[in-house]
């Protein structure tokens, strides 16, 4: 006899970072029939929702209209239909953003390298925090960190083609509380004609998300669909 | 820009009721989750109960059964009615709001909430 449903998934919209005193809403899609929804916070109840009618609705959101550190961290949901709770839908991580300070990107030896080159990725940020991380934009959400006083490298060893792209970093006061981001540095790797050609760009951030994240820092907009993927949620893990 | 403030505090023998008011200024009301939460003197500010836009409510076992929430949009008030009181539920009783939200939403969370009242005091002795 089943003793729980099964997990629910969870999500945030339109972003994972959201920018301090910005809005987020965090999804959360069980089952049709689900006559309640629980979104629990570090281990805590953090909102309710019953759809209605139940029957028809196999998603709720919990919107959060003015992001702060105290609501930065993990979160998770359950659903029950009738006495029958859910398993627990895998962590989010959520995370505020433009805490603080902006931190300075720079690259060695420079923005324009040829493959084969050693580069290193320099994030500096003068205010009190020792981790630092670098995005890059594309489909899979990898995060490099990097610790140090005031400073990390991100060193990339030889570079190919696959390299090339708009990175960024952020200055990180915990996991879940960044500072703004830096701004952009556009990496361009030049090789022989055959393998620039062939060598298909390996972007490293969600696409299209970054473009939400920064209109999410700009005008504070929603946008009503998911922009993430799944290896955003094992970002910080 | 959304103030709250809370009426109906008071010092009440044990077994007597009360009921608390929270009146909102503004025209948000209607899209806001409010909740009761309060605070005993040394301990952490605690939740005591909330309610949705939609009007769904959500309690906290210690107050189960003995304590309604309820609002009313034609008022911008939200109301916490209390009975069977305890010497356990002295403490400081505070409103609060989530302003804008989604119909159903009951946040349980105090860090959920962006807008608070000042508080009124509720004293239960014999």
């Known amino acids: 006899q089943q003793q729980t449903l099964p997990k629910p998934f969870i999500w945030a919209e339109p972003h994972f970072m959201v920018p301090k005193e910005k809005q987020v809403t965090i999804c959360c899609q069980g089952n049709y029939g689900a006559v309640e929804y629980q979104l629990h916070f570090e281990g805590s109840l953090f909102a309710v929702d019953r759809p209605k009618p139940p029957e028809r609705i196999n998603k709720v959101k919990f919107y959060i209209p003015d992001m702060n550190s105290r609501m930065a961290g993990q979160y998770s949901c359950i659903y029950r239909v009738g006495e029958l709770w859910s398993e627990p839908s895998n962590l989010l991580d959520l995370v505020v953003t433009e805490m603080y300070d902006t931190p300075t990107l720079s690259v060695h030896p420079g923005p324009e390298v040829i493959s084969g080159e050693k580069v290193t990725f320099y994030c500096r940020l003068d205010t009190a925090t020792s981790m630092f991380l670098l995005l890059k934009e594309g489909r899979s959400s990898h995060v490099q960190r990097g610790y140090g006083k005031v400073q990390a490298e991100f060193p990339l060893g030889p570079v190919t083609t696959a390299h090339r792209g708009t990175y960024r970093c952020f200055g990180s006061y915990n996991n879940h509380a960044w500072s703004f981001p830096s701004e952009p540095v556009k990496l361009l790797v030049t090789g022989d004609i055959e393998n620039t050609s062939l060598a298909p760009e390996d972007p490293t951030f969600p696409a299209d998300t970054w473009g939400t994240y920064l209109l999410t820092t700009e005008t504070g907009l929603q946008k009503d669909h998911a922009l993430w993927d799944h290896t955003a949620q094992n970002l910080l893990r | 820009e959304v103030q709250l403030v809370e009426s109906g505090g008071g010092e009440v023998q044990p077994g007597g009721s009360l009921r608390l008011s929270c009146a909102a200024s503004?025209?948000?009301?209607?899209?806001?989750?409010m909740g009761w939460f309060r605070q005993a003197p040394g301990k952490e500010r605690e939740f005591v109960a909330a309610?949705?836009?939609?009007?769904?409510?959500y309690y906290a076992d210690s107050v189960k059964g003995r304590f309604t929430i309820s609002r009313d949009n034609a008022k911008n008030t939200v109301y916490l009615q209390m009975s069977s009181l305890r010497a356990e539920d002295t403490a400081v009783y505070y409103c609060?709001?989530?302003?804008?939200?989604?119909?159903?939403?009951?946040?349980?969370?105090?860090?959920?909430?962006?807008?608070w009242g000042q508080g009124t005091l509720v004293t239960v002795k014999p």
């Open positions: 309610i949705s836009r939609s009007g769904d409510t």
């Open positions: 503004g025209r948000t009301f209607a899209s806001a989750a």
């Open positions: 609060a709001a989530v302003v804008p939200t989604y119909g159903n939403n009951i946040y349980v969370h105090s860090a959920a909430y962006n807008y």
